[in-house]
């Protein structure tokens, strides 16, 4: 199943993948699409990059803003809307026979969430993995998942692509607020 | 308009080569994945092999693979299907078909060239 | 693999009566799904892609329709040029495979 990322409506989406390119600076041809990875290529094409740089990108809203040489091919989508929700597929197609690697991405965009003040945590997200709250530049976003664990840093690894996960920053933690995603 | 042009086929011993070529023209042959699909006479279709834009990546059938070799020459606008190793269940019309341009269907086909394989 | 099966194999049908053409997947291929038309002797011809997407140049009376394991064609009202054999393929799961066929004869 694929990891889901929650945006908010205006902010921009940021959907991790990566491959370490060998030797350094020995790019291939990725592709990012919307819709799940079909046996070849990508479906609806957003952004295509070849072994030097991007050669297609559907809107201007599409960029690969990591260190694309160093095999950094996250996806950012800015100023994200209703319509940006669904399944996406990052394809990197290293060379050879049936090399490709493919990650399916699911983003979430929501309306902007309120920071409210909680008496209690709320428990509406019970997913023992969490579901991620992206709205900066070029990370995710801190978000927290009430009732579970404590702080936790933990950072899952396929293939190509890393997650990481974050907790509260202590000041929100200490004002008792929340973020109410549902 | 797009057209795709295969020629190569004919008569092949068993355990013998053969070497198909898809001329194309038309499009912007060097973004496309290019298929080989077959079809035994009076069976169904069969695909083979494909071959992403750059000639980066190539795919097989189970049936094929280490047998048959899928290129292309994007200064030529060729594809090419190397067959070796030729067996009788290979008898089939192959077909060289271009990719939609999203992964998940051929829009357009060639002709098609008969490849026989008998003693 | 991905299984893709064909119903009926054989469609006995009258010029302007509606055809119904059904693809079953042994296991869920989403909607990366196509229709081909082929008529004897020539090469396939793409009707419909994604489940339900007519392909350029195609006539509306064809449609697709489906998701997930069950895909339907459907022809609202066969002209004498869509007698031919038709064939479903998926490219969600590999490898790529393609139905058998259906036959739409002239009854």
């Known amino acids: 199943s694929e990891v889901e990322y929650i945006a908010e409506v205006g902010q921009n989406a940021y959907l991790p993948c990566s491959y370490t390119p060998a030797p350094p600076g020995n790019l291939v041809p990725v592709c990012w699409g919307k819709g799940a990875c079909p046996v070849f290529d990508c479906s609806n094409v957003v952004l295509r990059t070849d072994n030097r740089d991007v050669n297609d990108r559907t809107s201007g809203r599409y960029w690969l803003k990591g260190d694309f040489h160093k095999g950094d091919v996250s996806l950012t989508i800015e100023n994200v809307t209703l319509a940006d929700s669904g399944v996406y597929c990052c394809r990197i197609q290293i060379p050879g026979i049936m090399n490709d690697e493919k990650h399916n991405v699911k983003l979430v965009v929501i309306k902007p969430a309120k920071v409210t003040p909680a008496p209690t945590l709320q428990r509406d997200l019970t997913s023992a993995f969490p579901r991620m709250l992206t709205t900066g530049e070029h990370g995710p976003a801190e978000t927290q998942t009430p009732g579970s664990l404590p702080d936790v840093n933990l950072t899952v690894s396929n293939f190509f692509c890393e997650l990481q996960i974050f907790t509260l920053t202590n000041e929100l933690r200490d004002s008792g607020a929340t973020i109410r995603t549902a | 308009e797009v057209q795709l042009l295969e020629s190569g086929g004919g008569l092949v011993q068993p355990g013998g080569s053969l070497r198909l070529s898809c001329a194309a023209s038309?499009?912007?042959?060097?973004?496309?994945?290019i298929s080989w699909v077959r079809q035994a006479p009076g069976k169904g279709l069969e695909w083979v092999a494909a071959?992403?834009?750059?000639?980066?990546?190539?795919y097989y059938a189970d049936s094929v693979k280490g047998r048959f070799i899928i290129s292309r020459d994007n200064s030529k606008n060729t594809l090419f299907l190397q067959m070796n190793s030729l067996r009788a269940e290979d008898t089939a019309v192959y077909y060289c078909?271009?990719?939609?341009?999203?992964?998940?269907?051929?829009?357009?086909w060639g002709q098609g060239t008969l490849v026989t394989v008998s003693s | 693999e991905t299984v893709l099966t064909q119903s009926p194999v054989t469609l006995s049908l009258s010029p302007g009566e509606r055809a119904t053409l059904s693809c079953r997947a042994s296991?869920?291929?989403?909607?990366?799904l196509a229709w081909y038309q082929q008529k004897p002797g020539q090469a396939p011809r793409l009707l419909i892609y994604?489940?339900?997407n007519r392909a350029t140049g195609i006539p509306a009376r064809f449609s697709g329709s489906g998701s997930g394991t069950d895909f339907t064609l459907t022809i609202s009202s066969l002209e004498p040029e869509d007698f031919a054999v038709y064939y479903c393929?998926?490219?969600?799961?590999?490898?790529?495979?393609f139905g058998q066929g259906t036959k739409v004869e002239i009854k």
């Open positions: 078909a271009k990719d939609g341009g999203s992964g998940s269907y051929d829009d357009f």
């Open positions: 038309g499009f912007t042959f060097r973004t496309h994945l």
């Open positions: 071959i992403t834009g750059s000639g980066g990546s190539t």
């Open positions: 296991q869920s291929v989403g909607s990366y």
């Open positions: 994604d489940a339900s």
């Open positions: 393929q998926q490219r969600s799961n590999w490898p790529p495979t």
